[in-house]
């Protein structure tokens, strides 16, 4: 039998990915990070 039509069983949560670079002073260089949903993860 063919399968009936259904969407994927896996939910997709859309979140904003924000890359940022922050200057923390000439002696320390810069921090590059990745923010996912408001949390810095890298």
């Amino acid at each position: 039998d063919a399968e009936f039509r259904h969407d994927s069983g896996y939910e997709v949560h859309h979140q904003k990915l924000v890359f940022f670079a922050e200057d923390v002073g000439s002696n320390k260089g810069a921090i590059i990070g990745l923010m996912v949903g408001g949390v810095v993860i890298a």
Epitope: D1, A2, E3, F4, R5, H6, D7, G9
Partner: antibody, heavy 121, light 112 residues
Framework: QVTLKESGPGILKPSQTLSLTCSFS??????????VGWIRQPSGKGLEWLAH???????YYNPSLKSRLTISKDSSRNQVFLKITSVDTADTATYYC?????????????WGQGTTLTVSS | DVLMTQTPLSLPVSLGDQASISCRSS???????????LEWYLQKPGQSPKLLIF???NRFSGVPDRFSGSGSGTDFTLKISRVEAEDQGVYYC?????????FGAGTKLELK
């Protein structure tokens, strides 16, 4: 609120073509993921799924009846239609129009009141 | 076709008792997307069927928590923990994974 209402001829003779209309409100068949279908029930017996049509005009049929069934829609008028050719006494039943989506409403959450067909010579 | 076999076909119960209805599918009704489209509907005399449970164990909006669904693969159960008079009617299991979509023959719940 969501409502569905079936209409049909009531009585047909064997070999005639059945034309059913489902008029609905409270949702749109232009909405991605939405679908409307037909289920029938002979008096005092169980339920049999017939066909389903999706917002993008994709159609599914019961293979045992596919050669006799045609489902179609008019999204702008909020209507779905079912035609069954060459009816026989075995097609005597109550015909229900049902809503089912592919996403959040992926179940038969709303049913019409049903329209009764009698096939008799 | 996927055959849905319900037992018992008739279920006499007393008010306040627990009722249990079994539904077995002739083969797995796990869809390729990972979901199991097993549903339960109740049809009261003179009315259209109404949805109780979807995807095996999820109660539909407004359905009392006395109703619970369980199972997996090919073996499913509907339980009513404390039967009330308004629970009388015919209960149908249904699979929505494979074409044709198919219903069980129904279980008539009636009060003793």
């Amino acid at each position: 609120q969501v409502t569905l209402k079936e209409s049909g001829p009531g009585i047909l003779k064997p070999s005639q073509t059945l034309s059913l209309t489902c008029s609905f409100s409270g949702f749109s068949l232009s909405t991605s993921g939405m679908g409307v279908g037909w289920i029938r029930q002979p008096s005092g017996k169980g339920l049999e799924w017939l066909a389903h049509i999706w917002w993008d005009d994709d159609k599914y049929y019961n293979p045992s009846l596919k050669s006799r069934l045609t489902i179609s829609k008019d999204s702008s008028r909020n209507q779905v239609f079912l035609k069954i050719t060459s009816v026989d006494t075995a097609d005597t039943a109550t015909y229900y129009c049902v809503r089912r989506g592919t996403r959040l409403e992926d179940y038969f959450d709303f049913w019409g009141q049903g329209t009764t067909l009698t096939v008799s010579s | 076709d996927v055959l849905m076999t319900q037992t018992p076909l008739s279920l006499p119960v007393s008010l306040g008792d627990q009722a249990s209805i079994s539904c077995r599918s002739s083969r797995s009704i796990v869809h390729s997307n990972g979901n199991t489209y097993l549903e339960w509907y109740l049809q009261k005399p003179g009315q259209s069927p109404k949805l109780l449970i979807f995807k095996v164990s999820n109660r539909f909006s407004g359905v009392p928590d006395r109703f619970s669904g369980s199972g997996s693969g090919t073996d499913f159960t509907l339980k009513i923990s404390r039967v009330e008079a308004e629970d009388q009617g015919v209960y149908y299991c249904f699979q929505g994974s494979h074409v044709p979509l198919t219903f069980g023959a129904g279980t008539k719940l009636e009060l003793k």
